[in-house]
């Protein structure tokens, strides 16, 4: 069943029964409500596994990466795909399953002793390689979080936002990624015209903080499309 694929955790701290079957452990929503997704896609089934649309690896499960389902496919249509196991071909770290990373186009085991030196080298390699990604640009990398014992402070090298301390996100800076501050109200943010276009940025900004969204600055509405300034604004 879907749940057995997705979740192996026991139900803990269930709410008290309030009538119906809702209080019983493991009970699912009887009729799945329609859920609205960016782009207006609506799925109304619980029993059928539906691919999850994504813009970056961080949105997917721990054993998945975000990419176009067909090689050379439309970069705007991306879903979460199953990670690649050891010795399988890869184009970036996030494609490899936890405990592995992408080296010379192959998923290899993350050797704790040699890992840190090789990771920078591999990141640089993949950026310099024309065939480094499925869809023409690199995106957020993912590796086993056990590589990072403490949360990174601002400026620390990272692979994903969960490697960074609270209030920071993992964003590209030149050819590596570092922990940068999550954007505050009024700060300039990047509004991507198409999904995944953030992969083209050399100096990537974090997302807007809690309660904020990246919207066009009011006094820039008249400006041309290319010069529109977006800032983090209250919802």
């Amino acid at each position: 069943t879907l749940n057995s694929v997705l979740n192996s955790n026991a139900i803990k701290n269930l709410p008290p029964p309030l009538g119906g079957a809702a209080g019983h452990p493991g009970s699912a929503v009887s009729a799945a409500p329609g859920i609205l997704y960016p782009g207006g896609n609506k799925y109304q089934t619980i029993d059928n596994y539906q691919p999850y649309p994504c813009a970056e690896d961080e949105e997917c499960g721990t054993d998945e990466y975000c990419a176009s389902p067909t090689r050379g496919g439309d970069a705007g249509v991306q879903i979460c795909l199953a990670c690649r196991k050891r010795r399988k071909r890869c184009m970036r770290h996030a494609m490899c399953c936890p405990g592995n990373y992408c080296k010379n186009g192959i998923c290899v085991s993350s050797d704790q002793n040699h890992f840190r030196g090789e990771i920078e080298e591999t990141i640089t390699e993949s950026f310099g390689n024309d065939h480094s990604t499925l869809d023409g640009y690199s995106r957020r990398t993912t590796l086993s979080s056990k590589m990072y014992h403490t949360k990174g402070q601002e400026g620390s090298v990272c692979l994903r936002s969960s490697d960074c301390a609270s209030g920071l996100c993992c964003a590209r800076h030149f050819w590596s990624k570092i922990c940068k501050p999550v954007l505050k109200e009024g700060q300039v943010c990047t509004k991507h015209r198409r999904k995944g276009s953030h992969g083209l940025e050399i100096f990537q900004r974090c997302y807007c903080g809690e309660g904020l969204s990246c919207r066009i600055q009011k006094d820039h509405h008249q400006a041309s499309n290319s010069s529109r300034l977006h800032t983090c604004q209250r919802h």
Epitope: L2, N7, A32, I46, G61
Partner: nanobody, 129 residues
Amino acid sequence: EVQLVESGGGLVQAGGSLRLSCTASGRTFDNHAMGWFRQAPGKEREFVAAISWSLSRTHYADSVSGRFTTSRDNAKNTVLLQMSSLKPEDTAVYYCAAAPRPKRVSVSYFSTSSNYDYWGQGTQVTVSS
């Protein structure tokens, strides 16, 4: 001990607004989806809204889309549900819940209550006509 505690419920007139808050203690939930469910007397628990582990993704039931907004502040271990244009049919006990980031995620992951492994005790929301 891990706890999720909801607050902000109460009695409000139709068309009014309420802001529910869910505060986690005992651990952080950075790598969890945080969801809101509700249950009216004699009815089954139903999905309302969720925000994923990657802060940018929110999901809503059709019945609340455009009226409810969920957000989270990992630094404060808090999740919010801003409810506006409330209707009498929104009357229910509202629960906050946490679902771990799974190995594989599907479109229905966030609305499936059995994927959530931590639950609060709920807060009553009553909308009078």
